[in-house]
């Protein structure tokens, strides 16, 4: 049966025994800035082009053992959530991956900046259709990272990022705090904000909307046919990147403002239990869970 | 995220250094009274001191960025400091990434075209 997260974002008309919007997102390219990925995994083979971009810090610790499947874990799962054949949101989207996070999932602001610059230069050299950039990472507030995101957004690129897993105000983190970026928090199958150990999803006015981010089934780098469940605001952001790809594929001329408006318009409203958030943040945090447009848009989204 | 709201720096640390001295006889001295600012991550364990993103003013050309980077290296060398330019930015933001001692920040902030300097910091998979 359909995984809970795909059912949650799917309009009622499509809640059959499977989720298969034909060719969703085929006009859009999604850039993923993350770890290395297992690009020949059965779930994503032929859908992800691994660019030659790599800018990562050395792994911490003298006894660190670099195991390929672990190095690829985070990025492979997210690529699967965005465009995987069986558990992906936008099954028609093609992706390009840039490695900005090392085998421990750690990167730098500077490496991310150089990655964003690489995307801009690629866009200028070979203009394609709409671009979505997925940034499933977070660091402390960074003026320069936010500025780079602003410039890329002004160049017509849609940026989607994780709100952060610190159970804190997303405005204290980047790129989550960049106003031009679509910042995504995580909810679970009960529409509760996701708890992650002692922490959980970030919140506050810098979050644009929430999306499924707990127990998300996706491609596992443990083997070429494996699946695994992962949780986090990265997984939530990957859902929104997939939804954005489908919306842009159906309406390639959408501006960032129009896309943001549509994401909000089609979201489920007031379903999140706000008691989880600190009292002073409840009114500031959007009570929105991302969803695909309803069946009235069938000709646009499911052609 | 969340458009239409003014930026909030939160705990973000900002160190403003006024540009007073005209030392080193800069050919392109900054306009009188302008200040370049220094920023670093508020979360101490995430800081990466020793690597800095020098962001130049918006309309700065690549050649000017390269010249500014070279000037920084020359002035640092005169003070006995080794520096390494790791990357010159152009396309999104003008500027450069430099590996250098934090002792040189005051000097770097006085360079022409400099808008602000940010210490590098870590980002993490979420």
């Amino acid at each position: 049966s359909i995984p809970w997260n795909l059912e949650r974002i799917t309009p009622p008309r499509y809640r059959a025994d499977e989720y298969q919007p034909p060719d969703g997102g085929s006009l859009v390219e999604v850039y993923l800035l993350d770890t290395s990925i297992q690009s020949d995994h059965r779930e994503i083979e032929g859908r992800v082009m691994v660019t030659d971009f790599e800018n990562v810090p050395e792994e911490d610790g003298t006894r660190f053992h670099r195991q390929a499947s672990k190095c690829d874990s985070h990025g492979t799962h997210l690529a699967g959530v965005v465009s995987g054949r069986d558990a992906g949101v936008a099954k028609g989207a093609s992706m390009r991956s840039l490695r900005v996070l090392n085998c421990q999932g750690k990167g730098t602001v500077s490496g991310t900046l150089i990655g964003l610059e690489f995307i801009r230069k690629s866009q200028l050299v070979q203009p394609v259709g709409p671009l979505v950039v997925l940034l499933p990472l977070a660091g402390g507030y960074s003026r320069v990272l936010n500025a780079a995101c602003q410039r890329l957004a002004r160049a017509g690129v849609v940026l989607v990022t994780a709100a952060g897993n610190f159970r804190d105000d997303a405005c204290l983190y980047s790129p989550a705090s960049a106003p031009e970026v679509i910042t995504v928090g995580a909810t679970n199958a009960q529409d509760q904000p996701v708890t992650l150990g002692t922490l959980g999803t970030n919140f506050g006015r810098c979050v644009d909307l929430f999306a499924p981010g707990e127990d998300i089934i996706g491609a596992s780098s443990d083997c070429s046919t494996c699946f695994v469940s992962q949780s986090g605001t990265s997984q939530a952001a990957a859902h929104v990147a997939g939804i954005a790809a489908m919306m842009l594929s159906a309406e390639p001329e959408l501006t960032l403002a129009e896309l943001r408006q549509r994401l909000i318009h089609f979201s489920a409203k007031d379903v999140i239990n706000e008691a989880w958030f600190p009292e002073d943040q409840r009114v500031l945090t959007p009570n929105l869970v991302a969803a695909l447009p309803p069946s009235t848009h069938e000709n646009l989204y499911f052609q | 995220g969340a458009m239409g709201q003014e930026d909030e720096d939160g705990d973000y640390e900002e160190l403003v250094l006024a540009l007073r001295s005209e030392e080193d006889g800069l050919a392109e001295a900054p306009e009188h009274g302008t200040t370049a600012t220094f920023h670093r991550c508020a979360k101490d364990p995430w800081r990466l001191p020793g690597t800095y993103v020098v962001v130049l003013k918006e309309e700065t050309h690549l050649s000017q960025s390269e010249r500014t980077a070279r000037r920084l290296q020359a002035q640092a060398a005169r003070r006995g400091y080794l520096t390494k330019i790791l990357h010159v930015f152009h396309g999104l933001l003008p500027g450069f990434l430099v590996k250098m001692s934090g002792d040189l920040l005051e000097l770097a902030l006085k360079l022409p075209h400099v808008d602000y300097i940010e210490e590098d910091s870590s980002v993490f998979a979420q």
Epitope: D40, R42, E45, G46, V48, A68, R85, D86, K91, C223 | -
Partner: antibody, heavy 115, light 110 residues
Framework: EVQLVQSGAEVKKPGASVKVSCKAS????????ISWVRQAPGQGLEWMGW????????NYAQKLQGRGTMTTDPSTSTAYMELRSLRSDDTAVYYC????????WGQGTTVTVSS | ESALTQPASVSGSPGQSITISCTGT?????????VSWYQQHPGKAPKLMIY???NRPSGVSNRFSGSKSGNTASLTISGLQAEDEADYYC?????????FGGGTKLTVLG
């Protein structure tokens, strides 16, 4: 143009081994593994397994476990399938195909096992 | 894993439509969006005709279409032509491997 070019026909005695090669070109190797499929005379297609150009990982069909080895050499863009302890019922045309999706196929290599 | 079940043969006259079924279980055809169909002429390598249930690779005639309901996938060929005479194989993911159908011989009459 995406192409898979296989090595030539082989005649082997029972108990011997055979190694078939498959040279890939025209696409980004690491985006796809290589599947191996065989077809005995007058029979249907049988999936034997898959091998990665990215990291050399393999996924063998249960029936093949222990008797077959699939490898890749990214430096020459070539995948290999070795079958040991050959029996007469291993007589077949062996195909390589691109990825699990098997959207592009090699021309086939006839392996005859006969005493 | 057992082969998927296909009719051994089907036939039709030029211009007609025919459908070939491919029945599996919830662990293969019913559980994945990845059913493919291959055409094979005698002495030739198989050729991909349909992938991911209903998608056609570029260069394949739109007379070929695929669908799926529950544990059964179907290939429909409309406007039958003499060159369509061939063997047709379905294929599906399983949890860890791939499985083919036994094959269907399509004969174009007359």
């Amino acid at each position: 143009e995406v192409q898979l070019v296989q090595s030539g026909a082989e005649v082997k005695k029972p108990g011997a081994s055979v190694k078939v090669s498959c040279k890939a070109s025209g696409y980004t190797l690491t985006s796809y593994g290589i599947s191996w499929v065989r077809q005995a005379p007058g029979q249907g297609l049988e999936w034997m397994g898959w091998v990665s150009f990215y990291n050399g990982n393999t996924n063998y069909a249960q029936k093949l476990q222990g008797r077959g080895t699939m490898t890749t050499d990214p430096s020459t863009s070539t995948a290999y399938m070795e079958l040991r302890s050959l029996r007469s019922d291993d007589t077949a045309v062996y195909y390589c195909a691109r990825g699990y999706g098997m959207d592009v196929w090699g021309q086939g290599t006839t392996v005859t096992v006969s005493s | 894993e057992s082969a998927l079940t296909q009719p051994a043969s089907v036939s039709g006259s030029p211009g007609q439509s025919i459908t070939i079924s491919c029945t599996g279980t919830s662990s293969d055809v019913g559980g994945y969006n990845s059913v493919s169909w291959y055409q094979q002429h005698p002495g030739k390598a198989p050729k991909l005709m349909i992938y991911e249930v209903s998608n056609r690779p570029s260069g394949v005639s739109n007379r070929f279409s695929g669908s799926k309901s529950g544990n059964t996938a179907s290939l429909t060929i409309s406007g039958l032509q003499a060159e369509d005479e061939a063997d047709y194989y379905c294929n599906s993911y399983t949890s860890t491997s791939m499985v083919f159908g036994g094959g269907t011989k399509l004969t174009v009459l007359g």
